[in-house]
């Protein structure tokens, strides 16, 4: 059809209209008539591409006629009025309603003028994210799971992480026909360094004003990682008492601490107080290797530390260790 001239009438409508599954939507369509132009509209017609016949007709003398009267309604067209607004309301949107529609004005003397509108049927997805609790497997496993349920079109899921790893995303039909559930797993090799850190799942969808961000705090179960602190290699006779601390990182938390030496039980000057070992002043040099054994639900690990208490007074009075 040739392009309209300067004084021509124009049918105005958006190229695309979004509507939500199960809701109602209005397909807007208006006749724009220049100030000086005379026109008479005798009929409004809506049809769907690929289908014969009209789905909705409003005739100047006969009024409206619908292919599905309970689902369609002219919003503004009324008998006895100028037919300039062909906007059509559709109720109870279904997946199969998505497609191209033509809004047509039969005008005199300008003829038939039409415009095409693409109706997008959307479904807003529900999004959840959850941790996948893992142990030290030594190989890549899912540590977080992000699910966008019942979206149309399918939601787009991405991950943001400083820990490395890679996504594994899959799709499955949603509960409602035509909707899609997207599941994305964040996969990495578990380590104790990952435990307690977070990754973020970002869900994007046409129905969202902005992307939804869901943060997942990761859980990696691992046996204790043990070290002993509190000794600075400068312990001398006749100094104050000192403390050794058994530092343990584990998930779940440690259930018990056990102190011993390589020679067996603790000597009299060493007193265990949970994660700490109290070293009382001694009157003769010692050279003892202490062992701290830490237990949690996944096992036990230990650390060793050799302590020497040397002769020769310190330059300033101080404890055998800073405490």
């Amino acid at each position: 059809w040739p392009p309209p001239g300067t004084g021509d009438i124009i049918v105005q409508a958006p190229t695309q209209v979004p509507g939500f599954l199960g809701d109602s939507v209005t397909l807007p369509c208006y006749l724009q008539v220049p100030g000086m132009e005379e026109t008479h509209v005798s009929q409004l017609t809506w049809s769907r591409h690929g289908e014969s016949g009209s789905m909705a007709v409003f005739h100047q003398t006969q009024g409206p006629n619908y292919s599905e009267p309970k689902r369609l309604e002219f919003v503004a067209a009324r008998l006895g009025t100028e037919l300039r607004d062909a906007s059509l309301r559709m109720f109870g949107l279904r997946v199969e309603d998505e497609g191209n529609y033509t809004c047509l004005f039969v005008t005199f003397p300008q003829g038939s003028r039409s415009v095409d509108i693409w109706l997008r049927v959307l479904a807003k997805p529900q999004n959840t994210a959850e941790v996948q609790k893992v142990q030290l497997t030594g190989k890549p496993v899912p540590v977080a799971r992000c699910v966008s349920t019942g979206g149309r079109p399918p939601a787009h899921i991405t991950w943001h992480s400083d820990l490395g790893g890679m996504p594994n995303t899959s799709q499955a039909p949603g509960f409602l026909s035509g909707t899609v559930t997207v599941t994305s797993l964040w996969i990495l090799v578990p380590s104790s360094q990952v435990d307690g850190k977070s990754v973020t799942c970002k869900v994007e969808h046409e129905s969202f004003e902005k992307p939804q961000l869901l943060t997942v705090n990761l859980t990696v179960y691992y046996p204790p990682e043990v070290s002993i602190s509190g000794y600075d290699n400068n312990w001398y006779l006749s100094q104050n008492e000192a403390t050794l601390t058994c530092d343990a990182r584990s998930n779940p938390e440690p259930t018990g601490y056990n102190w011993s030496t390589t020679m067996g039980p603790l000597p009299p000057f060493a007193v265990a107080q949970g994660a700490q070992l109290l070293i009382r002043p001694v009157d003769k040099p010692i050279n003892t290797t202490f062992i701290c054994n830490v237990t949690n639900a996944l096992g036990a690990r230990q650390a060793e530390l050799t302590v020497q208490v040397k002769e020769g007074p310190p330059s300033e009075p101080s404890g055998m260790s800073s405490n």
Partner: antibody, heavy 121, light 109 residues
Framework: QVQLVQSGAEVKKPGASVKVSCKAS????????ISWVRQAPGQGLEWIAW????????NYNQKFTGRVTMTTDTSTSTAYMELRSLRSDDTAVYYC??????????????WGQGTTVTVSS | QAVVTQEPSLTVSPGGTVTLTCRSS?????????ANWVQQKPGQAFRGLIG???NRAPGVPARFSGSLLGDKAALTLSGAQPEDEAEYYC?????????FGGGTKLTVL
């Protein structure tokens, strides 16, 4: 077939009125647009107005506004054109024409045989 | 007041091609002028040929075609027949009224 049959010739005095009829057959009258056109002796064709038969909606050539009235009678599928305050220069053959649609546009499809109106004192 | 001008008369040989034009006093003819062409043979009623610049009416032979030619509307008759001898009128729309051209008398000789 589609036909428009007009009323017979009229002779009128200046200042009088004339009402010309145009009876349609062979199509759905109420969905049609009908134009009235005239041709004075030795002159060109002149468009007077159109009417949408279904509702009686009209559009008049401003030259004739106030002197001409177009009406329809859907029960008899007849269109009427009344011209008042006749002058001698209204002497002409008056035609009714039904507009038809071709493709996405209208055309002057079928014409009546014409009605001669003579205005003479 | 818009004036629509046509060639008063044209002659074409049988089988020949002829183009009738329609000029507007207000400037170039566009699709918004909804150019119509009607034919009147002697002693017969008018008959619509073309609507909306280039849409041939049902039953009109394909040898008749409408178009825009430069700044004018045009009716081209390709392969003229003796029965095409008639008066041809162009009609243009100007926002709120139709204006007829003076007509072209076409002779097929």
């Amino acid at each position: 077939q589609v036909q428009l049959v007009q009323s017979g010739a009229e002779v009128k005095k200046p200042g009088a009125s004339v009402k010309v009829s145009c009876k349609a057959s062979g199509y759905t009258f109420t969905s049609s647009y009908i134009s009235w056109v005239r041709q004075a002796p030795g002159q060109g064709l002149e468009w007077i107005a159109w009417i949408y038969a279904g509702t009686g909606d009209t559009n008049y050539n401003q030259k004739f506004t106030g002197r001409v009235t177009m009406t329809t009678d859907t029960s008899t599928s007849t269109a009427y054109m009344e011209l008042r305050s006749l002058r001698s220069d209204d002497t002409a053959v008056y035609y009714c024409a039904r507009h038809g649609m071709t493709g996405r546009g209208w055309y002057f499809a079928v014409w009546g045989q014409g009605t001669t109106v003579t205005v003479s004192s | 007041q818009a004036v629509v001008t046509q060639e008063p008369s044209l002659t074409v040989s049988p089988g020949g091609t002829v183009t009738l034009t329609c000029r507007s006093s207000t400037g170039a003819v566009t699709t918004s002028n909804l150019a119509n062409w009607v034919q009147q043979k002697p002693g017969q009623a008018f008959r619509g040929l073309i609507g909306h610049t280039n849409n041939r009416a049902p039953g009109v032979p394909a040898r008749f075609s409408g178009s825009l030619l430069g700044d004018k509307a045009a009716l081209t008759l390709s392969g003229a027949q003796p029965e095409d001898e008639a008066e041809y009128y162009c009609i243009l729309w100007y926002s709120n009224k139709f204006v007829f051209g003076g007509g072209t008398k076409l002779t097929v000789l």
